[in-house]
């Protein structure tokens, strides 16, 4: 192994490490709050956000919000810490490598939401049942 | 072994410029996205800015947007850190850092001091 270079003199208990120790790096996740968006009927859509943020904190993950009521429809772009909820709601699939949006229930609005741990994962929002592992079939695939 | 040596730091007034530079050795350095990190005192690490492996996308965190731009040279094995308009709260010690190593393996950092 590599010997250490001299202690530091800084505080390492501020420092995020993976099980390796390897220091761990924040996403890089689209982040332009929320915007008018024309996705709509759509299987996937791009989220039209030029805006690529380094997340402020390593443990932070890609979080895409797609809400429809009868005025418009908005897609909300951010990067958020799984172990809190956004929304009320829980990040269950933060560590996806993709957006797979999921439905939930919110009085007055058709709302989804998708979470997701790889650089700019939430650029591209996918809404198509074939990617839903909730899906008996696909998880044969998946664990033949 | 993986070496990375920052250099560049001092003293400098508000509003003024420096350029760091931070020497790879002991890996692929032109596979590699790299990153330059820093860290105020008793403060935890702040991501300053991210460079893919072939330097033609970049990214800045917000407080130094517009001020800062990263760029390397996979031919030297350098990367480096243009910083403009310094302000105090720019005082921190620099480090550059890729993927995948511990904090313990990372440089010594160098110290850049805004004060008038």
């Known amino acids: 192994t590599i010997p250490p270079h001299v202690q530091k003199s800084v505080n390492n208990d501020m420092i995020v490490t993976d099980n390796n120790g390897a220091v761990k790096f924040p996403q890089l996740c689209k982040f332009c709050d929320v915007r008018f968006s024309t996705c709509d009927n759509q299987k996937s859509c791009m989220s039209n956000c030029s805006i690529t943020s380094i997340c402020e904190k390593p443990q932070e993950v890609c979080v895409a919000v797609w809400r429809k009521n009868d005025e418009n429809i908005t897609l909300e772009t951010v990067c958020h810490d799984p172990k809190l909820p956004y929304h009320d709601f829980i990040l269950e699939d933060a560590a996806s490598p993709k957006c797979i949006m999921k439905e939930k229930k919110k009085p007055g609005e058709t709302f989804f939401m998708c979470s997701c741990s790889s650089d700019e994962c939430n650029d591209n929002i996918i809404f198509s049942e074939e990617y839903n592992t909730s899906n008996p079939d696909l998880l044969l695939v998946i664990f033949q | 072994e993986v070496q990375l040596l920052e250099s560049g730091g001092g003293l400098v007034q508000p509003g003024g410029s420096l350029r760091l530079s931070c020497a790879a050795s002991?890996?692929?350095?032109?596979?590699?996205r790299m990153w330059w990190v820093r860290q105020a005192p008793g403060k935890g690490l702040e991501w300053v800015s991210?460079?893919?492996?072939?330097?033609?996308?970049?990214y800045y965190a917000d407080s130094v947007k517009g001020r800062f731009t990263i760029s390397r040279d996979n031919s030297k094995n350098t990367l480096y850190l243009q910083m403009n308009s310094l302000r105090a709260e720019d005082t921190a010690v620099y480090y550059c850092a890729k993927d995948g190593l511990p904090f313990d393996y990372w440089g010594q950092g160098t110290l850049v001091t805004v004060s008038s």
């Open positions: 991210v460079i893919n492996a072939d330097g033609n996308r970049t």
């Open positions: 002991g890996f692929t350095f032109n596979d590699m």
